[in-house]
Interface confidence: medium
């Protein structure tokens, strides 16, 4: 079901956000905030 796929994808996105915020704020790893074109 498409809604289920969307929800699962969004959940993974939110978890990814949480991990990266943790890395930025707690471990001091500053990410690039945009993708650079090669």
């Amino acid at each position: 079901h498409s809604d289920g796929i969307f929800t699962d994808s969004y959940s993974r996105y939110r978890k990814q956000m949480a991990v990266k915020k943790y890395l930025a704020a707690v471990l001091g790893k500053r990410y690039k905030q945009r993708v650079k074109n090669k």
Epitope: K20, K21, A24, V26, G28, K29, R30, K32, Q33, R34
Partner: antibody, heavy 126, light 114 residues
Framework: QSLEESGGGLVQPEGSLTLTCTAS?????????MCWVRQAPGKGLEWIGC???????NTYYATWAQGRFTISKTSTTVTLEMTSLTAADTATYFC????????????????????WGPGTLVTVSS | DVVMTQTPSPVSAQVGGTVTINCQAS??????LSWYQQKPGQPPKLLIY???TLESGVPSRFKGSGSGTDYTLTISDLECADAAIYYC????????????????FGGGTEVVVK
Amino acid sequence: QSLEESGGGLVQPEGSLTLTCTASGFSFNSSSYMCWVRQAPGKGLEWIGCIFTGSSGNTYYATWAQGRFTISKTSTTVTLEMTSLTAADTATYFCARDRAYFLVGYFYATYYFDLWGPGTLVTVSS
Amino acid sequence: DVVMTQTPSPVSAQVGGTVTINCQASESIDSDLSWYQQKPGQPPKLLIYRTFTLESGVPSRFKGSGSGTDYTLTISDLECADAAIYYCQCTDGSSISGSYGWDAFGGGTEVVVK
């Protein structure tokens, strides 16, 4: 809350110098960085680098500063070690707190320099 | 590294007037831009962060805008105390794998109040 730089003064070309930034009224926390910025007489601001105030102590430097400049920290101070100094390094050196501002719905925090020290003058001359 | 270019400098206006300062990044910085005010013999003072958010205590006469590579600081109802040099700063993060940074400042714009 305040920051104060010390250790500036006259240094010979090719010499070394270590500047110290002391924090008062607040303690380093895990969502901020301490940074160094310099300003040559009559010129603009030039970012040198930052150190994460959390346990990792990760450092980030401007491309031009890598190799000659080293940032380190203790629980209440941050130091900037400078080597192979030349006249071009003559400047007022500021330390600043680089604070995290978390954005709802974004991958990353954004940062801004919300607290600055008064600066300390470094003169490189023979 | 990202390069920040400010124009014009200097810029002048009458008391009560309006000035606009432009800041252009060499590539998109996703609105991670701050503005600072510096007066002679003093350290810079934070005015605006994240393009448009006013720092506490900064008058609403200061307004930031922009996106992508182009950003603007507008000061309205100019006062004599607004005479200073204004700097933009890209506050994008550094690479996770390297120690090079993008916390680059623009060259500064002097505001003269007549």
